[in-house]
Interface confidence: medium
Amino acid sequence: KVFGRCELAAAMKRHGLDNYRGYSLGNWVCAAKFESNFNTQATNRNTDGSTDYGILQINSRWWCNDGRTPGSRNLCNIPCSALLSSDITASVNCAKKIVSDGNGMNAWVAWRNRCKGTDVQAWIRGCRL
């Protein structure tokens, strides 16, 4: 599924991401935009042999199990394919674990490079939340 901007903002808010660990909803929507272009089925392969999955591009070396990433930790204890569902529950629950890990949203390269320090509230402007 490819979410609309406001549709995703509403879904993320419903799942408790607004101000989760101090990160406003705009940060999460911005991260999703630049990680996956709001596409729940996005997959991208990394040079270390791992793969990033889903709307928040969660990595198989650390967070999920895709059955083929050497030394996978699977810290979210889920199959990576669950992160590709049109229901973002699994991605949100795993993202909450990631953002609580110590580096906050810096764990997402796209957030660090494209969202951090910008007017992230623009990503939810005009949305009925």
């Epitope: 040079t47 042999g49 059955g67 050497p70 199959p79 990576c80 394919s81």
Partner: antibody, heavy 116, light 107 residues
């Protein structure tokens, strides 16, 4: 136990298309990548690409882009590879395998012969 | 693409001999290297994963070693059922690639 059952041998004319199937049993089909491998005598094994059945995500070896197309039907736990514009160079045994990085589980292979 | 070069192309041995098969990668692939045996008209069979981890059911005479670019499959005291083709495969990056194979034949 994990099993991959491929469709039977095919004899096709040059220029035609063929669709090979790979039915998976014994594991959660949507969770693992299915990979496709080509074997020709004297050419060893070549990785064609992969599909994640749960999402339909695909990756192709550059060499096979435009030649192979992967699909999957999660209702029947079956992956498919279509090969188009067949030539004699496509005559080979084609294997599906479960993508664990390594390949512990293989289909029995589908022999494709392209001949006029 | 990562190229895997296997040597020798053919190895002629007598049952009871011990042999070493080589697989060399064109760049470092850590331990992401796997070994297969293939008999005529059969699918490949995984022997060793991640350079040195023997798969369940594989006889202990098979062992793997190496890391980086140089890998070895050793067969201690070859048995008649061991004859066939041996391939290495890397999973360090895409596209996945295989070596050209080593044919183990009876002398």
């Amino acid at each position: 136990q994990v099993q991959l059952q491929e469709s039977g041998a095919e004899v096709m004319k040059p220029g035609a298309s063929v669709k090979i199937s790979c039915k998976a049993t014994g594991y959660t089909f949507t969770t693992y990548w299915i990979e496709w491998v080509k074997q020709r005598p004297g050419h060893g094994l070549e990785w064609i690409g992969e599909i994640l059945p749960g999402s339909g995500s695909t990756y192709y070896n550059e060499k096979f882009k435009g030649k192979a197309t992967f699909t999957a039907d999660t209702s029947s736990n079956t992956a498919y590879m279509q090969l188009s514009s067949l030539t004699s160079e496509d005559s080979a045994v084609y294997y599906c395998a479960r993508g664990d990085g390594y390949y512990c589980y293989w289909g029995q292979g589908t022999t494709l012969t392209v001949s006029s | 693409d990562i190229e895997l070069t296997q040597s020798p192309a053919t190895l002629s041995v007598t049952p009871g001999d011990s042999v070493s098969l080589s697989c060399r990668a064109s760049q470092s692939i850590s331990n992401n290297l796997h070994w297969y045996q293939q008999k005529p008209h059969e699918s490949p069979r995984l022997l060793i994963k991640y350079a040195s981890q023997r798969m369940s059911g594989i006889p202990s005479r098979f062992s793997g070693s190496g890391s980086g670019t140089d890998f070895t499959l050793s067969i201690n005291s070859v048995e008649t059922e061991d004859f066939g083709m041996y391939f290495c495969q890397q999973s360090n990056s895409w596209p996945r690639t295989f070596g050209g194979g080593t044919k183990l034949e009876i002398k």
